[in-house]
Interface confidence: low
């Protein structure tokens, strides 16, 4: 899927009011340095496609993301706030209830999470532009990030 | 632990330029801005500027613009400030801040010790 | 460049007395951050995002505000209450206000 029509202060907003805190929650007990993040993203459709990716892809080691409550939020905000990507998604969540057994937190899970929320984090910090003005723009120019 | 760790203190006179240091561990050095503040004896706190050590952007106080520049290493963790054609009103603390997003805002979350900047003749 | 202005500029007060801290913007904000700052310190982040208490911050504070009005307030002063308080946004580039000093009485 192709997230660059997403509108994406509204899936912003929804990061900061709801699935920011179910990802801490998710965490809780973790140390915030306990894992190094190496997954990045470079402009906010590219975030949008890594954190699809860890969120509802399952991985070797933690195949029990997508019933979290912090990644039904991010579906349901993917899903109002991206043109198309309901559809595209229907057979993936097929596969997905297949593939689920029991709901077990590993290690291996916590460690995917705290890339995930690094991944949100720079989807939410555009990053500084190169000129040096000094108006903060997005890697795509198109967004101001004090703009709630 | 986070922690930001700055270079010693400095003395310059009228017209030189004077590069502080800023080493920061315990977190990602690319995750979050990195903002410069200095603070005369007795004045208020003064934003001078802020980089992105994930892509060297930047942003200027347009006070400084022209006299100050920001820079990073990534690869040693370390924020600069260079500060160029230094005046006796130059004298101050400098200080570098970590900013972090918080759900709600950009915020300076953890901030060097300073590092005392004399310009005299 | 948003001026903010903190008043009053040093508020005399006795220990258990109530401090009410203002700052004013030119132009309206999204949110305001709080930073305590004492002699010879560096400052230390005390109220994020308007009303959110950093780390470690007694109860007793309380942030609070939107467009261009915030106040900080202190319900007790406790001793180590006095100090410098300085307000800070970032809704256009970041500035500082001028700082109030809670000294005691």
């Known amino acids: 899927y192709d997230f660059t029509n997403c509108d994406f202060e509204k899936i912003k907003a929804a990061y900061l009011s709801t699935i920011s805190k179910d990802l801490i929650t998710y965490m809780s007990g973790t140390k915030s340095t306990e894992f190094n993040n190496t997954v990045s993203c470079s402009n906010r459709p590219h975030c949008l496609t890594e954190i699809q990716s860890l969120t509802f892809n399952p991985t070797a080691g933690c195949a029990s993301l997508a019933k979290e409550m912090f990644a039904m939020k991010t579906k349901a905000a993917l899903a109002i706030w991206c043109p198309g990507y309901s559809e595209t998604q229907i057979n993936a969540t097929q596969a997905m209830k297949k593939a689920r057994k029991s709901k077990v937190t590993t290690n291996k899970c916590l460690e995917q999470v705290s890339q995930l929320q690094g991944l949100w984090r720079r989807f939410n910090r555009p990053l500084l532009k190169q000129q040096g003005s000094s108006d903060y723009k997005d890697d795509d120019d198109k967004h101001h990030h004090h703009h709630h | 632990e986070v922690q930001l760790v700055q270079s010693g203190a400095e003395v310059k006179k009228p017209g030189a330029s004077v590069k502080v240091s800023c080493k920061a561990s315990?977190?990602?050095?690319?995750?979050?801005?990195m903002n410069w503040v200095r603070q005369a004896p007795g004045q208020r706190l003064e934003w001078m500027g802020i980089i992105s050590p994930y892509n060297g952007g930047t942003s200027y106080n347009q006070k400084f613009k022209g006299r100050v520049t920001l820079t990073v290493d990534k690869s040693a963790s370390t924020a600069y400030m260079e500060l160029s054609s230094l005046r006796s009103e130059d004298t101050a603390v400098y200080y570098c801040?970590?900013?972090?997003?918080?759900?709600?805002?950009?915020?300076?979350?953890?901030w060097g010790q300073g590092t005392t900047v004399t310009v005299s003749s | 460049e948003i001026v903010l202005t903190q008043s009053p500029a040093t508020l005399s007060l006795s220990p258990g007395e109530r401090a009410t801290l203002s700052c004013r913007a030119s132009?309206?904000?999204?949110?305001m951050h709080w930073y305590q700052q004492k002699p010879g310190q560096a400052p230390r982040p005390w109220i994020y995002a308007t009303s959110n208490l950093a780390s470690g911050v007694p109860a007793r504070f309380s942030g609070s505000g939107s467009g261009t009005s915030y106040t900080l307030t202190i319900s007790r002063l406790e001793p180590e209450d006095f100090a410098v308080y300085y307000c800070?946004?970032?809704?256009?580039?970041?500035?500082f206000g001028g700082g109030t000093k809670v000294e005691i009485k």
């Open positions: 801040a970590r900013e972090d997003y918080d759900y709600d805002g950009y915020a300076m979350d953890y």
């Open positions: 800070q946004q970032w809704s256009s580039d970041r500035t």
């Open positions: 132009s309206s904000v999204s949110y």
């Open positions: 315990g977190y990602t050095f690319t995750d979050d801005y």
